[in-house]
């Protein structure tokens, strides 16, 4: 059975939008006006994952691209990357764990915790134009809270 997905954009809690920075990286920066069209549109898929009270397992693909955010170890550190997949096989209900994020939503603020690396979150820097990354701290300098905007399919 096909997995259910919704198209959306994400902005961090400082209202920075996410845009492509090269073929396999996202960066966060403030956009306005027509520049808003640069922001990436995600296809958020609702996938299978471990049972948890307040966490919803999702995968975050780039709309109409065969790229998914994934979490892997690089130099022994959990790292966020954009990974290319075979579009014939993705998205699917049972995504590999590296593609799965636990969406935690409180008062319309979203966090995305790596299922592969608990307590590591999709993060942005306070600074402008910096890469989106996987961060191991919450509530510090780096930003782990996002808002979501629906996009028409």
């Amino acid at each position: 059975a096909p997995v259910r997905s919704l198209n959306c954009t994400l902005r961090d809690s400082q209202q920075k939008s996410l845009v492509m920075s090269g073929p396999y990286e996202l960066k966060a920066l403030h956009l306005q006006g027509q520049d808003m069209e640069q922001q990436v549109v995600f296809s958020m898929s609702f996938v299978q994952g471990e049972e948890s009270n307040d966490k919803i397992p999702v995968a975050l693909g780039l709309k109409e691209k065969n790229l998914y955010l994934s979490c892997v170890l690089k130099d022994d550190k959990p790292t966020l990357q954009l990974e290319s997949v075979d579009p014939k096989n993705y998205p699917k209900k049972k995504m590999e764990k590296r593609f799965v994020f636990n969406k935690i939503e409180i008062n319309n603020k979203l966090e995305f915790e790596s299922a592969q690396f608990p307590n590591w979150y999709i993060s942005t820097s306070q600074a402008e134009n910096m890469p989106v990354f996987l961060g191991g701290t919450k509530g510090g300098q780096d930003i782990t809270d996002f808002t979501m905007q629906f996009v028409s399919s």
């Epitope: 059975a1 049972e51 629906f150 399919s153």
Partner: antibody, heavy 120, light 107 residues
């Protein structure tokens, strides 16, 4: 107060159409699917389709495809279900219900129901 | 479409009895299962979502369990206000489907 309020009962002739409304209040209309479910007299529940007002995504039960149209008006927080080519078997109570966009909480709030009677 | 069977279709029980209702599916429906209560002439009322999570305000005598294809609603000690019809629903795959219902009657 969080609620879904549906339009009143309708009596329709076979072959005609009916449009049932479902007005939401007390929550963010955009972020919840509005589900449409019907229940024929003395029968069980049957899912007809859904709409997510925030994105415009719509999913229909194939059984009703071509006969049912689901829409939403974000400005009034109202969803609509129109059923055409009515026949006597469409006599039922039609319910709207809501479900969060991520499907987490199931059909957690229901309208009071709208009785549609199809009779010549 | 996912095939489903809810059983029993009806049962007679007394106040204080433990009541169990089951829903079986033709394929894995992950966590997307809810249970409802419906009284005559009224809209359904949600009791349990995501298999086992109790809706706010629903008494703790109601509980849900199961995984994969087999799911259960249990009422640990039936109360007078629990005499009603109960339905399961899967919302894992289109078309979403409701069980045929279980009418709980007074013995």
């Amino acid at each position: 107060q969080v609620q879904l309020v549906q339009s009143g009962a309708e009596v329709k002739k076979p072959g005609s159409s009916v449009k049932v409304s479902c007005k939401a209040s007390g929550y963010t209309f955009d972020r919840y699917w509005i589900e449409w479910v019907r229940q024929a007299p003395g029968q069980g529940l049957e899912w007809m389709g859904e709409i997510l007002p925030g994105s415009g995504d719509i999913n229909y039960n194939e059984k009703f495809k071509g006969r049912v149209t689901i829409t939403a008006d974000k400005s009034t927080s109202t969803a609509y279900m129109e059923l055409s080519s009515l026949r006597s078997e469409d006599t039922a109570v039609y319910y709207c219900a809501r479900m969060y966009y991520d499907y987490d909480q199931g059909f957690d709030l229901w309208g009071q129901g709208t009785l549609v009677t199809v009779s010549s | 479409d996912i095939q489903m069977t809810q059983s029993p279709s009806s049962l007679s029980a007394s106040v204080g009895d433990r009541v169990t209702i089951t829903c079986k599916f033709s394929q894995d429906i992950d966590r997307f299962l809810s249970w409802f209560q419906q009284k005559p002439g009224k809209a359904p009322k949600s009791l349990i979502y995501r298999v086992k999570r109790l809706v706010d305000g629903v008494p703790s005598r109601f509980s849900g369990s199961g995984s994969g294809t087999d799911f259960t609603l249990t009422i640990s000690s039936l109360q007078p206000e629990d005499f009603a019809t109960y339905y399961c629903v899967q919302y894992d795959e289109f078309p979403y489907g409701f069980g045929g219902g279980t009418k709980v009657e007074i013995k």
